[in-house]
Amino acid sequence: AVNGTSQFTCFYNSRANISCVWSQDGALQDTSCQVHAWPDRRRWNQTCELLPVSQASWACNLILGAPDSQKLTTVDIVTLRVLCREGVRWRVMAIQDFKPFENLRLMAPISLQVVHVETHRCNISWEISQASHYFERHLEFEARTLSPGHTWEEAPLLTLKQKQEWICLETLTPDTQYEFQVRVKPLQGEFTTWSPWSQPLAFRTKPAALGKD
């Protein structure tokens, strides 16, 4: 038997992936655990093996189909269970009725590229990945720029309150190396959270022309 508090948190990427983290205070030496997904209206069900990510937490990804296939809708509820092997039996350790479109976390934006760079400004674009057509334009973005001598945590957040997959960074310093990241969040869903940050895009502003201020 396992004692201690348990936390079971899952997010849907809006297409064909449910990522789950299960935390358990009590020790679970060498126990095999998995997450089982059972939708209330669909024919498929899916299982993934929980793998340790720290001393007391495990994670896994339920792959529901091809990355861009729409496997769930706003009407679906998925029963998610954490099952751990106890001898020859499986014991239910945690269970939740999961509403996918109330618990969204999209994939990080991809394909970041510099569209145009000058001495004091830089225009950057990106794409969203594996995002459902249900959102239409109901997405928002946050962006941050890493300046020399600073950390990501110190970088001010720029908020784009609409589906705008580009930004024009202003008031940059000439001939300076910067890094840029962006993340995305649907407006829908009570427990929806920000995507992970994108891979950083490194760019350098152009040097100031000689003889100019």
């Epitope: 209330d40 669909r42 809708t73 009407v75």
Partner: antibody, heavy 116, light 107 residues
Framework: QVQLVQSGAEVKKPGASVKVSCKAS????????ITWVRQAPGQGLEWMGD????????NYNEKFQGRVTLTVDTSISTAYMELSRLRSDDTVVYYC?????????WGQGTLVTVSS | DIQMTQSPSSLSASVGDRVTITCQAS??????LNWYQQKPGKTLKLLIY???GLHTGVPSRFSGSGSGTDFTFTISSLQPEDIATYYC?????????FGQGTKLEIK
Amino acid sequence: QVQLVQSGAEVKKPGASVKVSCKASGYTFTSHWITWVRQAPGQGLEWMGDIYPGSGNTNYNEKFQGRVTLTVDTSISTAYMELSRLRSDDTVVYYCARERGGFDYWGQGTLVTVSS
Amino acid sequence: DIQMTQSPSSLSASVGDRVTITCQASQDISNFLNWYQQKPGKTLKLLIYYTSGLHTGVPSRFSGSGSGTDFTFTISSLQPEDIATYYCQQDNNHPYTFGQGTKLEIK
């Protein structure tokens, strides 16, 4: 095998109510949504609503909101559809069906005739 | 509500013919599209679910394809027992909606 057996034909007066039953067998009743669809003679199909027997959760087509009530009795694996304030255009066949990636099993249908 | 437009409303074909019915949704429904068969005086039978999944016990001459708003239902070689009305239905969002039906007759 999965079976949905509906109650027999009914004749009702305008303004009255009708309650159609749908008895399920051959599967775990509480694990699948039961949906209700109606069909006028020689006409198309109209979704009325659905109910999840495991929780009693319901969804209704707004067209019928306030007139239709879906319930279940899990002890006898039976779903019910009650339609109130009947009108002559409610003279149609009512079907129950199990939902599992489409409506995979259907009842035989219940004809309700509304006539004064 | 999502409107489902089926065409043709009726068609006549010979035994052995390839028969195609189309269904168009008024908005993107991804692959949440099902096809049903109804013979005269009978209840409905599910043939195809999630655009192309063949329901248990359904002959392989029935197939479906499409995505988004445009869908196709095909009978590769028409048999006498296929005489029926065929309906498409979306289960992408409530209220679920059906096409108006295609009545298939033998020439």
